[in-house]
């Protein structure tokens, strides 16, 4: 999960494995102030998971979320 510092969530590690696409309802990018660029996926249970924006599955999920 992202770590919040002064209301700015940042990620310090990325999940490696793909999350089930059907479990993800939305996403957001962490702030440019964070040391690591990251995508945060929000699951249907409102859990937040940090992911590496350079990973193929992450880019694929972002594209499909944008289209839906």
């Amino acid at each position: 999960s992202p770590y919040s510092s002064d209301t700015t969530p940042c990620c310090f590690a990325y999940i490696a494995r793909p999350l089930p696409r059907a479990h993800i309802k939305e996403y957001f990018y962490t702030s440019g102030k964070c040391s690591n660029p990251a995508v945060v996926f929000v699951t249907r249970k409102n859990r937040q998971v940090c992911a590496n924006p350079e990973k193929k599955w992450v880019r694929e999920y972002i594209n499909s979320l944008e289209m839906s």
Partner: antibody, heavy 119, light 108 residues
Amino acid sequence: QVQLVQSGAEVKKPGASVKVSCKVSGYTLTEFAMHWVRQAPGKGLEWMGGFVPEDGETIYAQKFQGRVTMTEDTSTDTAYMELSSLRSEDTAVYYCATDPLYTPGLEPWGQGTTVTVSS
Amino acid sequence: SYVLTQPPSVSVAPGQTARITCGGNNIESKSVHWYQQKPGQAPVLVVYDDSDRPSGIPERFSGSNSGNTATLTISRVEAGDEADYYCQVWDSNTDHWVFGGGTKLTVL
């Protein structure tokens, strides 16, 4: 170092159920997604399903939906896979395999459990 | 669901290079993992995310992924490399892990 130790071989009659266990040592079960993969004699690997810790849910391969149940006992760091309504085509080696949080791919795997379905 | 196609067998002489392919529709858009399975043993991950190697896996094992084909390359093949090799991808349309049918590598 993570190690997975599975229960011993089973012989079952058609229509029965089998429950295979997989004990994790070296780490706690909650640090991993546990998956189950089977391999029929002389055939390839077939993914059956696995646990998604980030959502606390288990996903199953469509082929096994309704016939397989995967559970975990975190107090003993043991995962279980139960397959019901067994038929001869279910004769296979069943593997548990971990999907570590920060490393892609399934690694390591259990040693495998042979399940034979025969009347 | 997503289908991965592997040749059933590949033969190579010791010291030569073995190439094992894994075909899939636009597979370059997916991360491919490769497993080695020796007779009577559980599979072992040898390459992940197309071309990365887990610690302990020799540099002789490498991977690539382009277009509709991913390739596992084993250079300077040794007798101990004789095994079945499986590719694997995540299919986000079904939320399933998918394995290729496997390739038996024979060292002549």
